[in-house]
């Protein structure tokens, strides 16, 4: 008799999830020699231990603490780039601007980027059929709790000037419900962080509006100011040119506004 299995609203665990996590860990420690002390098998065991045999709507930050400990990594606290709804450009930027880091440039972020996972209560099985959706099922699911945990720690580590890349093409340029808006903003430490600088990325070629005046940006400024952190904002009118100028800052066309 087939055992009854909980049907969740979200997609199931990414196929070959264990192999992917292990392979990513091995690759990361190869290309980042300062992390070569990490034992990737132990990392996978800790990752697995966070959600296997646990109800996928009852995951806590505590479940991820062994993994957090193994993945402890020091990144320059004044070189942190946060992002919201514009991951690809943020990653393209840090691939060129090597001394800046997004969460996905750290070991733990790199391991989990674009993956989904969950288990089942009281069985050692990984659920490849479905996993809880944050909205339709529950917020305390393995994926959401993981990102909340690592995002909080990443924001807490930041200092001096912290940059955030925001998508100017969205109706809510700053969204209070995003990971940035709900977790990272509230975990920047005012005693360490002097300024949050927002880069609003324009989508349209002919879009010359000052999106720093957008009501949601003003809302972000208000939240940040109340936390005793200064706020500044820049429009990035031409993201393609922006990346090109990061690659070749000496280019004569890079002195004009981007």
């Amino acid at each position: 008799v087939p055992r009854w299995r909980q049907q969740w609203s979200g997609p199931g665990t990414t196929k070959r999830f264990p192999e992917t996590v292990l392979a990513r860990c091995v690759k990361y420690t190869e290309i980042h020699p300062e992390m070569r002390h990490v034992d990737c098998q132990s990392v996978w065991d800790a990752f697995k231990g966070a959600f296997i045999s646990k109800h996928p709507c009852n995951i806590t930050e505590e479940d991820y603490q062994p993994l957090m400990k193994l993945g402890t990594q020091t990144v320059p606290c004044n070189k942190i780039l946060l992002w919201s709804r514009i991951k690809d450009l943020a990653h393209q930027f840090t691939q060129v601007q090597r001394d800046m880091f997004t969460l996905e440039d750290t070991l733990l972020g790199y391991l989990a980027d674009d993956l989904t996972w969950c288990g089942e209560f009281n069985t050692s099985k990984i659920n490849y059929q479905s996993c809880p959706d944050w909205r339709k099922d529950c917020s305390n699911n393995p994926v959401s709790v993981f990102w909340k945990t690592v995002s909080r720690r990443f924001a807490e580590a930041a200092c001096d000037v912290v940059h955030v890349m925001l998508n100017g093409s969205r109706s809510k340029i700053f969204d209070k419900n995003s990971t940035f808006g709900s977790v990272e903003v509230h975990n920047l430490q005012p005693e360490k962080v002097q300024t949050l600088e927002a880069w609003v990325i324009h989508g349209g070629r002919e879009d010359s509006r000052d999106l720093c005046q957008d009501p949601t940006i003003k809302e972000l400024e208000s939240i940040i100011s109340k936390r005793n952190i200064q706020f500044s904002c820049k429009n990035i009118y031409r993201p393609d040119k922006f990346l090109q100028c990061v690659k070749n800052p000496e280019d004569s066309s890079c002195t004009s506004e981007i």
């Epitope: 091995v26 690759k27 190869e30 020699p33 300062e34 691939q95 090597r98 001394d99 790199y110 690659k247």
Partner: antibody, heavy 114, light 113 residues
């Protein structure tokens, strides 16, 4: 420590295999083992590295095709060189560690001359 | 491949003086930069790694700084034993196509008077 061997005098067009032997440690855990050369009176030139943890190999653009790096045992890395010319005359160093090269052998001289 | 441009190619300074050597990378390499000292007939010896970390047993007279594309090695309180050729070396990677490379600067000969 590291020690290179296999250098010597060869004719243009010949092939040669250099060997790097580690003593006091093995490559079983992941480290980068590299080959670097230095022509007489000139600077250092990176040729190739192998990451012993995965066996992944990396080459300078100019070295691709003519040079092959391999790990032949838990303590030995080789560099095969083909179609040698006078421009390949140099001291060849084996070096290891990671993003920086903390451990070097004394070098082996390769002379390409007819 | 990344190109490392090292300046000057030669520098002369008196005992007790200070020497500054600069190294520029053709692409941003973060802090993945090392400095080596090489004396005639010997292999290079690492002095500084990850731009500013002093290697074991290296005196604190050697100081590395910089990040991204511009790096500096400063040798203060120069001693006659510091006469050597100094090289910078970069390490670069890309995650997408699994590419890694190392590159050396052209070297700087330090002459101590």
């Amino acid at each position: 420590s590291l020690e290179e061997s296999g250098g010597g005098l060869v004719k243009p067009g010949a092939s040669l295999t250099l060997t790097c032997k580690a003593s006091g440690f093995s490559f079983s855990s992941g480290c980068d083992m590299c080959w670097v050369r230095q022509a007489p009176g000139k600077g250092l030139e990176w040729i190739s590295c192998i990451y012993t943890g995965s066996g992944s190999t990396y080459y300078a653009n100019w070295a691709k095709g003519r040079f092959t790096i391999s790990r032949t045992s838990s303590t030995t890395v080789t560099l095969q060189m083909t179609s040698l010319t006078a421009a390949d005359t140099a001291t060849y160093f084996c070096a290891g560690d990671s993003d920086y090269l903390g451990l070097w052998g004394p070098g082996t001289l390769v002379t390409v001359s007819s | 491949d990344i190109v490392m441009t090292q300046t000057p190619s030669s520098v002369e300074a008196a005992v007790g003086g200070t020497v500054t050597i600069k190294c520029q990378a053709s692409q941003n390499i973060g802090n993945y930069l090392a400095w080596y000292q090489q004396k005639p007939g010997q292999p290079p010896k690492v002095l500084i790694y990850r731009a500013s970390t002093l290697a074991s047993g290296v005196p604190s007279r050697f100081k590395g700084s910089g990040s991204g594309t511009h790096f500096t090695l400063t040798i203060s309180d120069l001693e006659s034993a510091d006469a050597a050729t100094y090289y910078c070396q970069s390490y670069y990677y890309t995650t997408d196509d699994n590419y890694r490379s190392w590159a050396f600067g052209g070297g700087t000969e330090v002459v101590v008077k």
